[in-house]
C-alpha cells in the first residue's frame, strides 16, 4: 500500500463507477430533490462532483457515506441528464446518466353524477375529470370515504366513468373522486357530492 497511489495502481474492482440515484424520480417544477452519489468501496477518501450535462453543480467529499446534493427543479431542462464523478487522487470514474421525469400536478377534479331512478334501484353514473396535470391520470371513486372502484387510468383528457346500482338507500351518501398521476404522494380530491336519502324531488341528479 503506497502513501501516494495513482490511478494505474488501482484495480478496476477496487474503484468501480459510482452510483447516482434519487428517492424521487418523478418531480414537479419547483420541487426540491436530493441526489445521492455513492461508491461500493467504503474505505476510499472519495471526492464526488455532480454535473448536469456539462455544468458543474457541486463537489463534496466522503468516506463510507454517500454525497448528498440538494437541488431545485425549476425548469424543464433541469430534468437532466445528471452524472456523478467519483475521484480518488488522479483516478476518476463517472456514473451512468440519471434523469428526472417532470410531471405537472393534477388539479382538483370535478365530480359529476347522473342518476336513473327506478322504484327499487338507483343506477348511478359517476364522472370525474381533472382538466390539468400530466397524463396518464388515475381516478378512483369513493363512497362515504371508502373506495368503490379500482384505479381507472385515463390517457386522454376525458372523464373517468364508473357505474353502480344501489337499492334506494335509507340515508344520505357522499361521493367524491381522487385524481392522481405519476407524482408520488400527490393526489387531489373533488368536492364531495351528497346524494339525498330518498327519491322524488329531493333527488336533483335523478332522471326518471
Amino acid at each position: 500500500r503506497k502513501a501516494v497511489l495513482d490511478c494505474e495502481a488501482m484495480k478496476t474492482n477496487e474503484f468501480p463507477s459510482p452510483c447516482l440515484d434519487s428517492k424521487t424520480k418523478v418531480v414537479m417544477k419547483g420541487q426540491n430533490v436530493s441526489m445521492f452519489c455513492s461508491h461500493k468501496n467504503k474505505s476510499l477518501q472519495i471526492t464526488y462532483s455532480l454535473f448536469r450535462r456539462k455544468t458543474h453543480l457541486g463537489t463534496q467529499d466522503g468516506k463510507g457515506e454517500p454525497a448528498i446534493f440538494n437541488l431545485s427543479i425549476t425548469e424543464a431542462h433541469e430534468s437532466g441528464p445528471y452524472k456523478c464523478k467519483a475521484q480518488v487522487t488522479s483516478c476518476s470514474k463517472y456514473s451512468r446518466d440519471f434523469s428526472f421525469t417532470i410531471v405537472d400536478p393534477v388539479t382538483s377534479p370535478v365530480l359529476n353524477i347522473m342518476v336513473i331512478q327506478t322504484e327499487t334501484d338507483r343506477h348511478i353514473t359517476l364522472h370525474c375529470l381533472s382538466v390539468n396535470g400530466s397524463l396518464p391520470i388515475n381516478y378512483t371513486f369513493f363512497e362515504n370515504h371508502v373506495a368503490i372502484s379500482p384505479a381507472i387510468s385515463k390517457y386522454d383528457r376525458e372523464p373517468a366513468e364508473f357505474n353502480l346500482t344501489k337499492k334506494n338507500p335509507g340515508e344520505e351518501e357522499e361521493y367524491r373522486c381522487e385524481a392522481k398521476n405519476r407524482l408520488p404522494n400527490y393526489a387531489t380530491y373533488s368536492h364531495p357530492v351528497t346524494m339525498p336519502s330518498t327519491g322524488g324531488d329531493s333527488c336533483p341528479f335523478c332522471l326518471k
Epitope: V4, S49, D61, T89
Partner: antibody, heavy 117, light 111 residues
Framework: EVQLVESGGGLVQPGGSLRLSCAAS????????MIWVRQAPGKCLEWIGI???????YFANWAKGRFTISRDNSKNTVYLQMNSLRAEDTAVYYC???????????WGQGTLVTVSS | DIQMTQSPSSLSASVGDRVTITCQAS??????LSWYQQKPGKAPKLLIY???TLASGVPSRFSGSGSGTDFTLTISSLQPEDFATYYC?????????????FGCGTKVTVL
C-alpha cells in the same frame, strides 16, 4: 523520490504574520487533500486544518479567523498563512497529504515557527 | 466537534511486555481512526489505519481494534525501537470544521 518540504518558518514577533509553504517533489499534489499539523515543544500533535482537492478549507475551531490554507497547483505547493501570531503558536509545523484512504501517511520534516519579542 | 481522549498519558514498560493504549472519541467516528508513532525530532509515522488495518512495512506486533468511540492500540511484545510517543487521530467520514483531532499522546518509556 517522493518527498515533502515545509519552509517559511523562523522567528516572528507577536502580532506578526508568516506564510509557510509545503512543496512536493516526485508526485503531484493537485488531487490530494492536504492537512497542516503543528506540535509545540514537548506538547501534543494538533490538527490545524485541511484543504480539499477542490480547494474548500476546514479548520479546527481555535484556528478559524487567524489561519488560512491555500494551494497553487501550478507550483505543486500548499500554503499556511498565519496572522496575529502569539507566543503559544510557537511550534513545528508539518504538512501531509491524505492517502487514498483519507489518512496522512507521507510527512515532511516540519518547519519551526518561533513567536517571541 | 470531535475530541480524542488518549490514555494513559505515559507508561513505563520493559522489552517483551504487552502494551495497550486506548483512545476515546467524543462522538462516534465509525472506524475512521489511525495510530501514529513519533520519535523525538521526527515526523509521525503511520502504524494503523481504519482502526485495525496495519500500514505497509509495520511489524505485526502492532495491532488495532475498536469502532464507534472506543479504540485500542496493542503492542504484543515491546521491542527496543518501540519506545516512542503514540498518537491516535480520529476523523469524521466527511471533511468539516473541527472534524479531525489527535489524541494528546502516550509516551512509552523504559521501565
Amino acid at each position: 523520490e517522493v518527498q515533502l518540504v515545509e519552509s517559511g518558518g523562523g522567528l516572528v514577533q507577536p502580532g506578526g504574520s508568516l506564510r509557510l509553504s509545503c512543496a512536493a517533489s516526485g508526485f503531484s499534489l493537485n488531487n490530494y487533500f492536504m492537512i497542516w499539523v503543528r506540535q509545540a515543544p514537548g506538547k501534543c500533535l494538533e490538527w490545524i486544518g485541511i484543504i480539499t482537492s477542490y480547494h474548500t478549507t476546514y479548520f479546527a475551531n481555535w484556528a478559524k479567523g487567524r489561519f488560512t490554507i491555500s494551494r497553487d497547483n501550478s507550483k505543486n505547493t500548499v500554503y499556511l498563512q498565519m496572522n496575529s501570531l502569539r507566543a503559544e503558536d510557537t511550534a513545528v509545523y508539518y504538512c501531509a497529504p491524505y492517502d487514498i484512504y483519507g489518512y496522512p501517511t507521507l510527512w515532511g520534516q516540519g518547519t519551526l515557527v518561533t513567536v517571541s519579542s | 466537534d470531535i475530541q480524542m481522549t488518549q490514555s494513559p498519558s505515559s507508561l513505563s514498560a520493559s522489552v517483551g511486555d504487552r502494551v495497550t493504549i486506548t483512545c476515546q472519541a467524543s462522538q462516534s467516528i465509525g472506524a475512521y481512526l489511525s495510530w501514529y508513532q513519533q520519535k523525538p525530532g521526527k515526523a509521525p509515522k503511520l502504524l494503523i489505519y481504519e482502526a485495525s488495518t496495519l500500514a505497509s512495512g509495520v511489524p505485526s506486533r502492532f495491532s488495532g481494534s475498536g469502532s464507534g468511540t472506543d479504540f485500542t492500540l496493542t503492542i504484543s511484545s515491546l521491542q527496543p525501537e518501540d519506545f516512542a510517543t503514540y498518537y491516535c487521530l480520529g476523523a469524521y467520514g466527511r471533511s468539516s470544521d473541527d472534524g479531525t483531532a489527535f489524541g494528546c499522546g502516550t509516551k512509552v518509556t523504559v521501565l
